[in-house]
């Protein structure tokens, strides 16, 4: 056979579906790697074709359009299962061709099962929820051409295990769930199924996301350093360990970055010669504000190291912060034998 | 005692402004609640002009109406609505109502309301 | 926006009698209604809340059902402190959030 442009197997589009429930997969070359659409493709006499690998084989076959009910069919650049199975799961490719030109992509298929609380193996999807914010919603999502507009699909909302009704401050608007006050205690997987009516037969999608309740960007500030701060002197003798904690408080902001970093001199401690090592680590509040903490360490500090200026730093999208840490030499105390007793004018 | 009591109506030319206050008494405004303004022109019905979100966010929803002529605010107890342009049709008793957002969205407290006339 | 539209605008009705009010939305407002009393001179009165559960302090007479677009107040009894302005107000709160009143139904002495 001819040369085939052979995009492989795609993992980053791993697709998931729920068994016994209708899937519509669209074929990635034309999101993903094609620059023309499949109407462009079709009126240029290319031609689809779809074929699959079964889980654990490695034998590519065609996919049977000719099931009963027709449980698997191709639309446009579209794969419909009507509904899925469970050994549906395997690799898929698409191939747009002709005499001239291929071009060739296969993605993996992964049908899922779930329980009644609708717990599964899926990948779930997030949607953060501002805290105390006003009105805000999510949407049940991937729903969109399943049923034409003329059908009226029944929307059912829950939460965890519990069908949403009656629910206070969580009110469920069909493909919408509105909340009119989203709470930490609301923080929790929503699952929206969606039952429409085709030829006869009646078809279930299950959604479920995870909805995270996180600070208010009203509430936000920017970055606060705790550390260092001007109540600790860090007062060490040439030899010891000089250990400073940055501790910087970041807001949580949708979509920014956090940055703590350290500046000795003026230089960042990969510019200089002094051996240095700083370590980090991360925490987060229930609302996702995070606190971050770099420790500074230089392991045996010279008399040099103890005249320089080390400051912290930190950014976010709500501004940049400096502060410098207070380092000083230790003045030696007196020893007391001959000193003292000089004082007192012994011989 | 729970409640709301209103301020600030008066007689005022058209295209006059005019700023009505509502004091909560008995509560104090959180996230809970939403504070709204709704007004009754003379022997008609309801209308509702606008809320505003109690808690930190201070979130607005506006009748498509009020938009860009009315306008809600609040501090710690106090309710807002300051009414630009003002035309003859405002005339209206305007009454400020505390709403649950923890109780489905009740309107569970009203103000006994205030009056507005706006005439030459 | 949303309409809200109440009948009727007004009816005659005896004590003891069953009264039923209806109210349509111009759109689905999934059972984000609510029905108030309103006597002359005096602040709206809430009855009922998210379509049929009955605020604090409301005699069980009161009751109200439906959903989607329709939705009913009933008074199964009508007593002589029931004679008033009746109001239903709808809430949407996906899209642009917004409230809207019925026109109103009187209920005066047959």
């Known amino acids: 056979s001819e040369r085939c442009d052979d995009w492989g197997l795609d993992t980053m589009r791993q697709i998931q579906v729920f068994e016994d429930e209708p899937a519509r997969i669209k074929c990635p070359l034309f999101e993903h790697f094609l620059k023309f659409n499949y109407s462009t493709a079709h009126s240029a006499g290319l031609t689809l074709i779809w074929y699959w690998t079964r889980q654990d084989r490695d034998l590519e076959e065609p996919i049977n359009f000719r099931l009963p009910e027709n449980r698997i069919s191709k639309e446009k650049d579209v794969l419909w299962f009507r509904p899925t199975l469970l050994n549906d799961t395997g690799n898929y490719t698409c191939m747009l061709r002709n005499t001239t030109y291929c071009s060739k992509v296969a993605f993996p298929l992964e049908v899922v099962q779930k329980d009644s609380c609708f717990n599964s193996p899926m990948k779930l999807p997030v949607h953060k929820l501002y805290i105390e914010y006003g009105i805000q919603r999510i949407t049940c999502p991937n729903v969109d051409g399943y049923f034409p507009s003329s059908v009226k699909p029944t929307i059912t909302w829950y939460m965890g295990c519990y069908k949403i009704q009656n629910f206070n401050n969580v009110i469920p608007e069909g493909m919408n769930l509105s909340f009119l006050i989203a709470l930490i205690s609301n923080n929790g997987n929503y699952t929206c199924v969606v039952t429409y009516p085709e030829n006869g037969r009646t078809f279930h999608l299950t959604r479920t996301l995870t909805v995270k309740v996180v600070g208010s960007p009203k509430n936000a500030v920017p970055p606060v350093i705790h550390s260092p701060n001007d109540h600790v002197v860090y007062e060490k003798e040439p030899g010891e360990e000089l250990l400073i904690p940055c501790t910087v408080y970041f807001s949580f902001l949708m979509d920014s970055r956090n940055e703590v970093w350290w500046t000795i001199d003026g230089k960042k401690p990969d510019d200089i010669t002094i051996d240095v090592t700083i370590n980090e680590s991360i925490s987060h509040s229930r609302t996702e504000d995070e606190t971050r903490t770099q420790i500074l360490s230089i392991k045996k500090v010279t008399s040099e190291d103890l005249k320089r200026s080390y400051v912290c730093h930190a950014r976010s999208a709500k501004g940049e912060v400096a502060k410098a840490a207070k380092v000083k030499q230790k003045v030696p105390a007196p020893r007391y034998t001959v000193e003292l007793a000089c004082g007192f004018g012994a011989t | 005692q729970v409640q709301l009591q209103e301020s600030g109506g008066d007689l005022v030319q058209p295209g006059a402004s005019l700023r009505l206050s509502c004091a909560a008494s008995?509560?104090?405004?959180?996230?809970?609640?939403?504070m709204c303004w709704v007004r009754q022109a003379p022997g008609k019905g309801l209308e509702w002009v606008a809320c505003i979100y109690a808690g930190s966010s201070g979130s607005t929803y506006y009748a498509s109406w009020a938009k860009g002529r009315f306008t809600i605010s609040k501090n710690s107890s106090t309710l807002y609505l300051q009414m630009n342009s003002l035309r003859a049709e405002d005339t209206a008793v305007y009454f400020c109502?505390?709403?649950?957002?923890?109780?489905?969205?009740?309107?569970?407290?009203w103000g006994q309301g205030t009056l507005v006339t706006v005439s030459s | 926006a949303i309409q809200m539209t109440q009948s009727p605008s007004s009816l005659s009705a005896s004590v003891g009698d069953r009264v039923t009010i209806t109210c349509q939305a111009s759109q689905n407002i999934y059972s984000n209604l609510a029905w108030y009393q309103q006597k002359p001179g005096q602040a709206p009165k809430l009855l009922i809340y998210?379509?049929?559960l009955l605020a604090s302090g409301v005699p069980s007479r009161f009751s109200g059902s439906g959903s989607g677009t329709d939705y009913t107040l009933t008074i199964s009894s009508l007593q002589p402190e029931d004679f008033a302005t009746y109001y239903c107000?709808?809430?949407?709160?996906?899209?642009?959030?917004?409230?809207?009143f019925g026109q109103g139904t009187k209920v005066v002495i047959k």
């Open positions: 008995g509560f104090s405004f959180s996230s809970t609640y939403y």
């Open positions: 998210a379509a049929s």
């Open positions: 107000q709808g809430a949407v709160y996906s899209g642009n959030t917004e409230w809207a």
């Open positions: 109502a505390r709403v649950d957002g923890s109780s489905s969205g009740s309107w569970d407290l």
